[in-house]
Amino acid sequence: YNVFPRTLKWSKMNLTYRIVNYTPDMTHSEVEKAFKKAFKVWSDVTPLNFTRLHDGIADIMISFGIKEHGDFYPFDGPSGLLAHAFPPGPNYGGDAHFDDDETWTSSSKGYNLFLVAAHEFGHSLGLDHSKDPGALMFPIYTYTGKSHFMLPDDDVQGIQSLYGPGDEDPNPKHPKTPDKCDPSLSLDAITSLRGETMIFKDRFFWRLHPQQVDAELFLTKSFWPELPNRIDAAYEHPSHDLIFIFRGRKFWALNGYDILEGYPKKISELGLPKEVKKISAAVHFEDTGKTLLFSGNQVWRYDDTNHIMDKDYPRLIEEDFPGIGDKVDAVYEKNGYIYFFNGPIQFEYSIWSNRIVRVMPANSILWC
């Protein structure tokens, strides 16, 4: 997290806000509800209280405007700048302005007013942008899904550094951004994508370029807004420029940023039995056109060319790949080796000699 220079903050805990005008995109009650919920994000974790005024001067004046709207920080038409807010202080201090050239919504369409407002009110209270891609105060808008919003830990630390904790946090679970060099790190899924490696963990993925050591961290939804926050497995089919992503009983085919029509599909359409609830890992072999699908202690082999499951499957993981354990969290193939991830450990397995040749920490893939 980052606070503003000179640690700008309110010197009182009871703050007022006023909605000066409304966007035509939403009903008045939807707008009021979005702002109320956005303030609650911050009051839940601090001693701050927010009261709405219907007229007069409030600490935080909220308005919608377009282009030049009276503060010498003009908006720029659709997309680009969405909103801005001033840090704590008199006059403009704390005020939040929203660009009415955007389409504001209470859903995933356009820009979600609650999410943008919660971010802007962070500025109104003294938080600057965070470098943590998981933080609400990260400067890139990402719709995080329909489920109950949980304020990330980085933002909690930031706001409590200014105002201290509240009496009781009604939602004490604050998602932490994974630390790639945590020795206990386990991974959810790994796939190549157009020459890069995508390493999935919780609602994030690291993107690793072959010539670089520093992996870049992204929210999965910043790349693919329609996908679930977390995924179970992934593999690339390079000759078709597709990647396949699995979550629960569903899977998606993606070309770059775009989901192919007809997806998601059910994993049972691949020929998996109905009792298989999820795929834990998947890896594709371009030379044979086969894909290994792991679930529980079993492995299936799918023929991607003929779109059928191979006979004699499922088989036990321990029988086909002795020594790697009875589950696979994530897997990928490179230069004749399969890399199996099981908890905080990865096994380098030689396809040619059919044996484990190295055991390494899982996060050595991230150069830790």
């Epitope: 997309s79 890139i140 990402t142 910043s222 775009d258």
Partner: nanobody
């Protein structure tokens, strides 16, 4: 419906630069990914660069660090700035909106001579 028209075709010496543009007509351009593909003679069409609606970029390993993709949603235009061009970059470059099942331009020829 989205119509895409590429411009910026040209011949350039190795090490030179070129900028391709892709003008889109149709109001849904800003809601679609914008990509560049290329096809060299006798080869398959291959991905070059992509930019999401949220302006996150993705490059083929062979062009990363040399090419830059950008978009201007208000103008309905996408760009590909190509620097340090190599003879192997010679191809017909296609603009695409929305991925493989999306919309395609007719292509523009780029020739890089040594």
């Amino acid at each position: 419906e989205v119509q895409l028209v590429e411009s910026g075709r040209g011949s350039v010496q190795a090490g030179g630069s070129l900028r391709l543009s892709c003008a889109a007509s149709g109001s849904t351009f800003s809601r679609r990914s914008m990509n560049w593909y290329r096809q060299a003679p006798g080869k398959q069409r291959e991905f070059v660069a992509g930019i999401s609606t949220g302006r996150i970029t993705n490059y083929a390993v062979s062009v990363k660090g040399r090419f830059t993709i950008s978009r201007d949603n208000a103008e309905g235009t996408g760009y590909l700035q190509m620097n340090s061009l190599k003879p192997e970059d010679t191809a017909v470059y296609y603009c695409n909106a929305g991925g493989l099942q999306g919309y395609w331009g007719l292509g523009t020829q780029v020739t890089v001579s040594s």
